[in-house]
Amino acid sequence: RTTTCFGDGCQNTASRCKNGGTWDGLKCQCPNLYYGELCEEVVSSIDIGPPETISAQMELTVTVTSVKFTEELKNHSSQEFQEFKQTFTEQMNIVYSGIPEYVGVNITKLRLGSVVVEHDVLLRTKYTPEYKTVLDNATEVVKEKITKVTTQQIMINDICSDMMCFNTTGTQVQNITVTQYDPEEDCRKMAKEYGDYFVVEYRDQKPYCISPCEPGFSVSKNCNLGKCQMSLSGPQCLCVTTETHWYSGETCNQGTQKSLVYGHHHHHH
């Protein structure tokens, strides 16, 4: 956030940039949390825009019995590996075809034991506050589907009649990693010393990191004709004085008519 300065007072302003602001020759360049001519004001809203998507990775092991292991399968650039990868990927795409979050598979290692396939199943979902539940559900469906296919597609009389056959007991889920996104934590961190006063509110399933000085939210502080300003002790209303009234009170809701004061009378609205 920047505020441009013109005229003789500018040099004087330069040395007065506050809160880590830096002078660029024209204006104070303020750090993210501040704005104003001297970077003296605390912003009321911090952008913690979530990622568009959240990913999960499941580390799985399956044993393919319809292919005999050869040393060439260890070499990821060999024709054998490339062909195995193509067939395995096509097979897994069929297995997981009903899972909207499914992105694909990535083979990490092939080893002896018929062919033991260490691989990652990649999942992705659009960010919503319920993303954890969505991905948890998807990982459960992955487990169900891979268990089912490795139980059904098995060798009969030493021949596989499916695209691939599996060893029923060779299926294992090693690990599940979900990209962590915690808007509350991000909000607290980015608000730094004002972290106690910033909260996350959702609008159209998007998180907003706001202080009570940001209007239009359930936590918003109503300062009436005054101005909400954040300080280290929390949000405060700075009350205005008009030609006819002084305003006071925690929310600037108490107006005193100047003429009555001069006339030694107090009148509250």
């Epitope: 319809s66 292919v67 005999k68 050869t70 067939t87 096509e90 060798m155 009649s161 695209m163």
Partner: nanobody
Framework: EVQLVESGGGLVQPGGSLRLSCAAS????????MSWFRQAPGKEREGVAI???????GYADSVKGRFTISQDNAKNSLYLQMNSLRAEDTAVYYC?????????????????WGQGTMVTVSS
């Protein structure tokens, strides 16, 4: 790139014999697997026989004891000896190859294909 060319198809009477050949370019013979598939009119392609570089052979139940798969690595050729032919053996016969040592008679497991040769069993 692997290229497969089948030959030997034709018209044969029930109970007769026929020998199909498949000439292959590339070195799949010494490394992977070769197989024969067939597709009858209006039906799905089905596995007939398979042979792997480790010497293993496998057959579909419908042809066991009647058909024999073999290969000649020196000539880069695959063969299918078909005896006691029946009307239901009528189909286009395809040669397929893989760099993998396969134990699968599902066409989706195979990556390289010939154009096919027609076998008609009829009196």
């Amino acid at each position: 790139e692997v290229q497969l060319v089948e030959s030997g198809g034709g018209l044969v009477q029930p109970g007769g014999s026929l020998r199909l050949s498949c000439a292959a370019s590339g070195n799949t013979f010494s490394r992977g697997s070769m197989s024969w598939f067939r597709q009858a009119p209006g039906k799905e392609r089905e596995g007939v026989a398979i042979i792997s570089s480790d010497g293993w052979t496998g057959y579909a139940d419908s042809v066991k004891g009647r058909f024999t798969i073999s290969q000649d690595n020196a000539k880069n050729s695959l063969y299918l000896q078909m005896n006691s032919l029946r009307a239901e053996d009528t189909a286009v016969y395809y040669c397929a190859a893989s760099f993998l040592v396969l134990r699968a008679l599902n066409p989706k497991a195979w990556h390289y294909w010939g154009q096919g040769t027609m076998v008609t069993v009829s009196s």
